[in-house]
């Protein structure tokens, strides 16, 4: 058993049918010595008396808010949560496996630049009685500071019969140098509590590996005289690290017809302009990627050919 | 993804082309190592990230773009100084800091070259003959060092009398390649920045 926060405790259980569970001793936070009784949640049934209460925690029915009283007055509370270990592996019931970029990916994180700021998100089908708390650091043995905000519900989607909820959090490394070569990964830890179930999820990454630039901005077309060709031009996104000559991007320019089946013409360039043939009803899209370290491509920025 | 091959103008900063070749070569070598050594811990998540140049050179600090010198987090240590005569210093405007930066890059390349050559000698003794260093990568390191053209004492190749532990050598190769790729990215950024300056 360990303390998650004041008066909230997590009991770790080896979870299998007929498991013996864990013996837990609760102590009433009071100078009083006698006349103390214990109850669980809203029930008025007295579970025991005395300054301490010994219970065998086996199932969720044994978890909850234990309260010690004296003469009708509440002295203190202890909330017991359960953390299930199923055959040596901690349960992952609360969050959905996003399966990207690989199986057992519960937390996904992205950064728009090298400033040390990043966003993580996760999915669940649970809509109520759900709380998250997020901590982060650079490295784990001698951790350096990363400050995270509160997790917020950022999107709701309908998936088949189920509703899916997306939560996200923004974090900022306290003293980040955009040019630094990372040798210790960022660690992100999310505590999730659903009703009386506790779970924790972690992700470990280098900022360089989660970079995804914003799409190029100011995408414009300039028709070339007496030609079907157009000059496409764009600019680096505002959110990208500066100076751009140091943090350079490379670009992919795509001409896509109305039909998805039509052949896509693609050109790669390090410049912020390109000359392409603009077909009728086609659209021109441009996306960006770090020129020197191949992390994710940005989303496409698009303009119609007409 | 293959990086686009740059064909520099004669007036272009002479080292940019070489640094792009270097990044391409080390990235290819790392990819090959990850595939060949699939049963060894060779991915970024599995290895310890060690920097053999730590406390010996200060490339990131010495080569920091001017725009980032206002960022206190980027100014940890800028004390290291090096010999300052190199052929990449194409214009007279080149500052002392630029010379320091390029000489730090040269020292990095020299250190990695020695490590890679020592390692290759060990890998050639492996009866499995599983993996060797790409000669192209070693040649590209050499070309960039020649382009930088700093005078510096030659570092003797380390020779080891004990029987090599091939498992450890292959893991060390992965660690070295990951670190060198990261440094090659920094070198490429620096060359691109200097070329634009």
């Amino acid at each position: 058993i360990w303390e998650l926060k004041k008066d909230v405790y997590v009991v770790e259980l080896d979870w299998y049918p007929d498991a013996p569970g864990e013996m837990v001793v609760l102590t009433c936070d009071t100078p009083e010595e006698d006349g103390i009784t214990w109850t669980l949640d809203q029930s008025s049934e007295v579970l025991g008396s005395g300054k301490t209460l010994t219970i065998q925690v086996k199932e969720f029915g044994d978890a909850g808010q234990y309260t010690c009283h004296k003469g009708g007055e509440v002295l203190s509370h202890s909330l017991l949560l359960l953390h299930k270990k199923e055959d040596g592996i901690w349960s992952t019931d609360i969050l959905k496996d996003q399966k990207e970029p690989k199986n057992k990916t519960f937390l996904r994180c992205e950064a728009k630049n090298y400033s040390g700021r990043f966003t993580c998100w996760w999915l669940t089908t649970i809509s109520t009685d759900l709380t998250f708390s997020v901590k982060s650091s650079r490295g784990s043995s001698d951790p350096q500071g990363v400050t995270c905000g509160a997790a917020t519900l950022s999107a709701e989607r309908v998936r088949g019969d189920n509703k899916e909820y997306e939560y996200s959090v923004e974090c900022q490394e306290d003293s980040a140098c955009p040019a630094a070569e990372e040798s210790l990964p960022i660690e992100v830890m999310v505590d999730a509590v659903h009703k009386l179930k506790y779970e924790n999820y972690t992700s470990s990454f280098f900022i360089r590996d989660i970079i995804k630039p914003d799409p190029p901005k100011n995408l414009q077309l300039k028709p070339l005289k007496n030609s079907r060709q157009v000059e496409v031009s764009w600019e680096y996104p505002d959110t990208w690290s500066t100076p751009h000559s140091y943090f350079s991007l490379t670009f992919c320019v795509q001409v896509q017809g109305k039909s998805k089946r039509e052949k896509k013409d693609r050109v790669f360039t390090d410049k912020t302009s390109a000359t392409v043939i603009c077909r009728k009803n086609a659209s021109i899209s441009v996306r960006a990627q770090d020129r020197y370290y191949s992390s994710s491509w940005s989303e496409w920025a698009s303009v119609p050919c007409s | 993804r293959n990086l686009p091959v740059a064909t520099p103008d004669p007036g272009m900063f002479p080292c940019l082309h070489h640094s792009q070749n270097l990044l391409r070569a080390v990235s290819n070598m790392l990819q090959k190592a990850r595939q060949t050594l699939e049963f060894y811990p060779c991915t970024s998540e599995e290895i310890d990230h060690e920097d053999i140049t730590k406390d010996k050179t200060s490339t990131v600090e010495a080569c920091l773009p001017l725009e980032l010198t206002k960022n206190e987090s980027c100014l940890n240590s800028r004390e290291t100084s090096f010999i300052t005569n190199g052929s990449c210093l194409a214009s007279r405007k080149t500052s002392f800091m630029m010379a320091l930066c390029l000489s730090s890059i040269y020292e990095d390349l020299k250190m990695y070259q020695v490590e890679f050559k020592t390692m290759n000698a060990k890998l050639l003794m492996d009866p499995k003959r599983q993996i060797f260093l790409d000669q192209n990568m070693l040649a590209v390191i050499d070309e960039l060092m020649q382009a930088l053209n700093f005078n510096s004492e030659t570092v003797p190749q380390k020779s080891s009398l004990e029987e090599p532990d091939f498992y450890k050598t292959k893991i060390k190769l992965c660690i070295l390649l990951h670190a060198f790729r990261i440094r090659a990215v920094t070198i490429d950024r620096v060359m691109s920045y200097l070329n634009a300056s």
């Epitope: 979870w15 299998y16 049918p17 007929d18 199923e86 055959d87 | 811990p41």
Partner: antibody, heavy 115, light 112 residues
Framework: QVQLVQSGGGVVQPGRSLRLSCAAS????????MHWVRQAPGKGLEWVAF????????YYADSVKGRFTISRDNSKNTLYLQMKSLRAEDTAVYYC????????WGQGTMVTVSS | SYVLTQPPSVSGTPGQRVTISCSGG????????VKWYQQLPGTAPKLLIY???QRPSGVPDRFSGSKSGTSASLAITGVQAEDEADYYC????????????FGTGTKVTVLG
Amino acid sequence: QVQLVQSGGGVVQPGRSLRLSCAASGFTFSSYGMHWVRQAPGKGLEWVAFIRYDGSNKYYADSVKGRFTISRDNSKNTLYLQMKSLRAEDTAVYYCKTHGSHDNWGQGTMVTVSS
Amino acid sequence: SYVLTQPPSVSGTPGQRVTISCSGGRSNIGSNTVKWYQQLPGTAPKLLIYSNDQRPSGVPDRFSGSKSGTSASLAITGVQAEDEADYYCQSYDRGTHPALLFGTGTKVTVLG
């Protein structure tokens, strides 16, 4: 004490269907994940499928994906394996088992796919 | 498609020590715990070892398990005639959990 009693096995022709049941008692069935495991005659153990405690997630071996469906009825304390498009290579003893560091197995039920 | 490899058979005389190996990889045994099962002819498998080296109550102490790196082993110290059975190791793969990964199985024969 924990008990898993299996039923539903038998002889079936290729291409036909069969449903296996596993009735649980002696524990809170709705709190635990469940597996199906099979063993072809003279061969080793092969995992078939898993279902979460609440039925929210199901996982299958590639060899049965799209043909077999694992399900559970927590109100009846029963686990099921619906098998469709049966093949000769599905001939085996099928076991249900609880998920956890200590597990309990059903007695097994024989499924023979033969024309 | 078994990823955990066991020797097809091992044998010993009563009182001898026999060991069965179970060889896997970094993503299965290297990252997860190992179980061992005993299966007597015509019966369901019975758990002998869980969490690499833990014995459930009721399992004789002549059975012991261990794990090192990407392989595990089961030792029967002072093998007895009633130990003649098939033995299977089991683990998970970190990418496909909760799918059970079984070993190829080992037939233990007690001679004499």
